[in-house]
């Protein structure tokens, strides 16, 4: 199954495998300062780290990819660490009539897996 | 938006950016020969290639990731090429009572994007 050992034990050492990490970013960093008003700084959770064999496999495809990468590393890439789910965020932004609130469902990662 | 230029034009040259590629794999390659009977060989579509800035961005998060990677390449990884959808596959496999068919929804990639 996609959740087989060694799904959650990182063989590379602490903090090296696919995990969620917080990155501070300003609206200027994101190029959003002309239309987003607030918050001025976002705590963006992102997926970082390596995906050793079968670690946090997203699904059957990711397991196959990991196996074939072992057999044909030049042809098949290793799985990589990407979001498995997202946390909605509400932003205050400029509109023609003033300021409004809008939710973004796909902005901040909530969980990560290897796909 | 996630679909802004240069979403689909690869700046790295033909075949270098994130795309679907067919990889031939036998049941032995996959370690499935003891329980899958047929097909003996699978044409596995996989996602390969690089994800230059904004190319085939999966969503807002991927766009942000691309931008922050440009600003902090040591801290934020570039987006990577992963399946956006899958093609179901039917396999014939052994059971205690003989042989049965089973569909796998997450085995073969159908489309790719940068996440």
């Amino acid at each position: 199954s996609a959740h087989a050992h060694p799904r959650d034990s990182c063989p590379l050492g602490p903090g090296r495998c696919c995990h969620l990490e917080t990155v501070q970013a300003t609206l200027e960093d994101l190029g959003w300062s002309d239309w987003v008003l607030s918050p001025r700084q976002l705590q963006l959770s992102m997926c970082v780290g390596e995906c050793p064999h079968l670690y946090r496999s997203a699904n059957t495809h990711a397991q196959i990819k990991a196996r074939l990468h072992g057999l044909q590393p030049d042809k098949v890439p290793a799985p990589c660490c990407v979001p498995s789910s997202y946390t909605p965020v509400v932003l205050m932004h400029r509109t023609d009539s003033g300021v409004s609130l809008q939710t973004y469902d796909d902005l901040v990662a909530r969980g990560c897996h290897c796909a | 938006s996630a679909h802004a230029h240069p979403r689909d034009s690869c700046p790295l040259g033909p075949g270098r950016c994130c795309h679907l590629e067919t990889v031939q794999a036998t049941l032995e390659d996959l370690g499935w020969s003891d329980w899958v009977l047929s097909p003996r060989q699978l044409q596995l579509s996989m996602c390969v290639g690089e994800c230059p800035h904004l190319y085939r961005s999966a969503n807002t998060h991927a766009q942000i990731k691309a931008r922050l990677h440009g600003l902090q390449p040591d801290k934020v990884p570039a987006p990577c090429c992963v399946p956006s959808s899958y093609t179901p596959v039917v396999l014939m496999h052994r059971t205690d009572s003989g042989v049965s068919l089973q569909t796998y929804d997450d085995l073969v990639a159908r489309g790719c994007h940068c996440a």
């Epitope: 008003l37 946390t87 609130l101 939710t103 | -």
Partner: antibody, heavy 119, light 110 residues
Framework: EVQLVQSGAEVKKPGESLKISCKGS????????IGWVRQMPGKGLEWMGV????????IYSPSFQGQVTISADKSISTAYLQWSSLKASDTAMYYC????????????WGQGTLVTVSS | QSVLTQPPSVSGAPGQRVTISCSGS????????VNWYQQLPGTAPKLLIY???NRPSGVPDRFSGSKSGTSASLAITGLQAEDEADYYC??????????FGGGTKLTVLG
């Protein structure tokens, strides 16, 4: 420790003005939005509006637009809710609440300010 | 009339399990997380569950939240007398921003 401390109960007459306050402490006041929530006697919670104390941007619920004014003074870490002309129907408990990191929920609440409007 | 619909009251005996439902639509619960607040008699509301199923520190694991489609529910197991309170669900609606359910009064019997 994060705390939101609101001003005391008020008894007013219809037509009078009023400004109630909510002082934040134990966190960076300008880094989190503050919302105001009304609870009429024996009723449920109603969201009134939100302010970003850092930029003083405000957004109101359509039901409260034009009825109240939300403001903040970041130098004293205080948010305000005010009325220019009270009505008997404004009688309620008013809560200030701090928004969580991503602006989708209220993680800390003030103790509430009871406003009674009666002739 | 609240945008999110909750039953006005639920009850249960000590030790029992009770659930409180919160029904919305595709413009609120369907697209955003649900949060739950507990309001003990005479006090301010307190965050109980955020982002569908997360408990803030200090909230006992007897409280749990879940969401499916356009509905959410709060479950309380091992009911205790001190759980007697009003419970509110809250989400975000594209037309009116932050919305609350009408509230559910939980009575602990006996």
């Amino acid at each position: 420790e994060v705390q939101l401390v609101q001003s005391g109960a008020e008894v007013k007459k219809p037509g009078e003005s009023l400004k109630i306050s909510c002082k934040g402490s134990g966190y960076s006041f300008t880094s989190y939005w503050i919302g105001w929530v009304r609870q009429m006697p024996g009723k449920g919670l109603e969201w009134m509006g939100v302010i970003d104390p850092g930029g003083s941007y405000t957004i109101y619920s359509p039901s409260f637009q034009g009825q109240v004014t939300i403001s903040a003074d970041k130098s004293i870490s205080t948010a305000y809710l005010q009325w220019s002309s009270l009505k008997a129907s404004d009688t309620a408990m008013y809560y200030c609440a701090r928004y969580g990191r991503y602006g989708t929920y209220f993680d800390y609440w003030g103790q509430g300010t009871l406003v009674t409007v009666s002739s | 009339q609240s945008v999110l619909t909750q039953p006005p009251s639920v009850s249960g005996a000590p030790g029992q399990r009770v659930t409180i439902s919160c029904s919305g639509s595709s413009s609120n619960i369907g697209v955003l997380y649900v949060n739950w607040y507990q309001q003990l008699p005479g006090t301010a509301p307190k965050l109980l569950i955020y982002s569908n199923d997360n408990r803030p520190s200090g909230v006992p694991d007897r409280f749990s939240g879940s969401k499916s489609g356009t509905s959410a529910s709060l479950a309380i197991t091992g009911l205790q007398a001190e759980d007697e309170a009003d419970y509110y669900c809250q989400s975000w609606d594209s037309s009116s921003n932050y919305v609350f359910g009408g509230g559910t009064k939980l009575t602990v019997l006996g």
